[in-house]
């Protein structure tokens, strides 16, 4: 007969590890007992458990409550055991010694490998502002055994750099994602992807990019000057800008206070029925935490009668 086992048994931290040991015997052969021990190099053998056909499964005090037989079916020639709730310290060499009748004793070794799945963390870099050069957008760190793989998934153009730190039983990998901030990146996802043999699927942590910027301001509403005449109702000026964080708006008049009846509503300046008093230079002041912008326009309220008189004069002059 011969012993069947595995060279390496791989288990995820916290799971139960099945340590296989099966005696492939000839007809009529029987297994009397199976002894399991840990046999790491440089240390004496440490008994785990003894499976005896008559006296049952005896577990050594150091492994009490952690070594059991696997669930059925169990073959009388199968000396496999379960090591419950595997921890990193369980990683190492194990030996099963099988006493058979009438063939004698056999032994085999296996290596237990305990995978420690990573718990990744993503840390955003400093606040991103348009106009900066190459800037850290985020760093992603994952520690596990063996070392995890850390990559990035994004539509955003950037560069990555990784570094690794080895610990006694694990390794920490940190990857950084750098980019040149631009407003087009706002709201774009930047995803850290961590791969590891102890994970059923990749772990993903997504960070949404926020780039501070403030666009140039402009004022709309004066496209047709002929509409700005005495008596017109519903005239308004609208300040156009965009930014992150969203900007606030403030209206002033350069050559004096805002005329009475002029109403400010955020980015919009609303006028009552126009009079010549409304002529002047108006300033839209746009600001956010990142920057501020100004845009000014000149409003010239026309007097239709003056205009028609001038036209008559021109006609008569000709």
């Amino acid at each position: 007969g011969e012993l069947e086992t595995s060279d390496v048994v791989t288990v995820v931290l916290g799971q139960d590890a099945k340590l296989p040991c099966f005696y492939r015997g000839d007809s009529g052969e029987q297994v009397g007992q199976v002894a399991w021990a840990r046999v790491d190099a440089g240390e004496g053998a440490q008994e785990l458990a003894l499976l005896h056909s008559k006296y049952g499964l005896h577990v050594s005090p150091a492994y009490e409550g952690r070594v059991e037989q696997p669930p059925p079916p169990r073959n009388p020639l199968d000396g496999s055991v379960l090591l419950r709730n595997a921890v990193q310290a369980d990683e190492g060499e194990y030996e099963c010694r099988v006493s058979t009748f009438p063939a004698g004793s056999f032994q085999a070794r296996l290596r237990l490998r305990v995978l420690v799945p990573p718990l990744p963390s993503l840390n955003p870099g400093p606040a991103l502002e348009e106009g900066q050069g190459l800037t850290l957008a985020a760093s992603c760190t994952a520690e596990g055994s063996p070392a995890p793989s850390v990559t990035w998934d994004t539509e955003v153009k950037g560069t990555t750099s990784s570094r690794s730190f080895k610990h006694s039983r694990s390794a920490a990998v940190t990857s950084e994602f750098h980019l040149v901030p631009s407003r087009s990146m706002n709201g774009q996802p930047l995803t850290c992807v961590v791969s590891h043999p102890g994970l059923l699927q990749d772990q993903r942590i997504t960070h949404i990019l926020h780039v501070s910027f403030l666009a140039e301001a402009s004022v709309r509403g004066l496209e047709d000057q002929n509409l700005w005449h005495i008596g017109r109702e519903g005239a308004m000026l609208k300040c156009l800008s965009e930014g992150q964080p969203p900007p606030s708006y403030n209206w002033t008049r350069l050559d004096g206070p805002l005329p009475s009846g002029v109403r400010v509503d955020g980015d919009t300046l609303g006028f009552p029925p126009l009079t010549t008093e409304h002529s002047g230079i108006y300033v839209c002041h746009v600001s956010n935490e990142f920057s501020s912008r100004d845009s000014q326009v000149t409003v010239d309220v026309l007097d239709p009668q003056e205009d028609s008189g001038k036209q008559v004069d021109l006609v008569s002059a000709s």
């Epitope: 499976l51 005896h52 056909s53 499964l57 577990v59 037989q69 059925p72 079916p73 073959n75």
Partner: antibody
């Protein structure tokens, strides 16, 4: 002598509870998977529940799952079956049995204890 | 769950007869089957495990065979103390299940 002795049976009303005990002698209980089997009057054997040697794995028949709890105290060399929400159909002789190492067949049985559920 | 069906349910035989009891499993259980003997008012007693291995102390007139879904228990020469009820049990997977039993009576 290797033996198992059950106790705790008796008459109980429907909806009531009982706790059966099984004391092992002549061997170390913590070396074996342990089981409960029942037999209704004039009927065949019905497997009820099993617990692994270290107590880490417990198994139940569908007919008792959620109502019965198997447990063991290896220090006291004892096995237990906590039976709640008892029904008339739980009336039976309850046996504890030892699961043999290597193949699981029930090699040692207790003499049984009768549980009668009736109003 | 795995169902076990024993046949016959009742069997009348005489001392010295060769008796065969069959146990059929609803699905493949390899060789993971045990046979028990039970006498009235007594606990069951293990006769055979993994289909064909005789439990220590059990007389050699008892034998078991089969694998997969079809198993048999044979008593080569029935003795007076063998009149009892016999049960098969699958120990392939939980929930463990028993056959309904075969009662061997004196003819």
């Amino acid at each position: 002598e290797v033996q198992l002795v059950e106790s705790g049976g008796g008459l109980v009303k429907p909806g009531g509870s009982l706790r059966l005990s099984c004391a092992a002698s002549g061997f170390n209980l913590n070396h074996y998977n342990m089981n409960w089997v029942r037999q209704a009057p004039g009927k065949g054997l019905e497997w009820v529940s099993s617990v692994s040697s270290g107590g880490g794995f417990r198994y139940y028949a569908d007919s008792v799952r959620g109502r019965f709890t198997i447990s063991r105290d290896n220090a006291k060399n004892s096995l237990y079956l906590q039976m709640n929400s008892l029904r008339a159909e739980d009336t039976a002789v309850y046996y504890c049995a030892r699961g043999a190492v290597f193949h699981d067949a029930f090699d040692i049985w207790g003499q049984g204890t009768l549980v009668t559920v009736s109003s | 769950d795995i169902q076990l069906t024993q046949s016959p349910s009742f069997l009348s035989a005489s001392v010295g007869d060769r008796v065969t009891i069959t146990c059929r499993a609803s699905q493949d259980i390899s060789s993971y089957l045990a046979w028990y003997q039970q006498k009235p008012g007594k606990a069951p007693k293990l006769l055979i495990y993994v289909a064909s291995t005789l439990q220590s102390g059990v007389p050699s007139r008892f034998s078991g065979s089969g694998s997969g879904t079809e198993f048999t228990l044979t008593i080569s020469s029935l003795q007076p103390e063998d009149f009892a009820t016999y049960y098969c049990q699958q120990i392939n997977s939980y929930p463990f299940t028993f056959g309904q039993g075969t009662k061997v009576e004196i003819k």
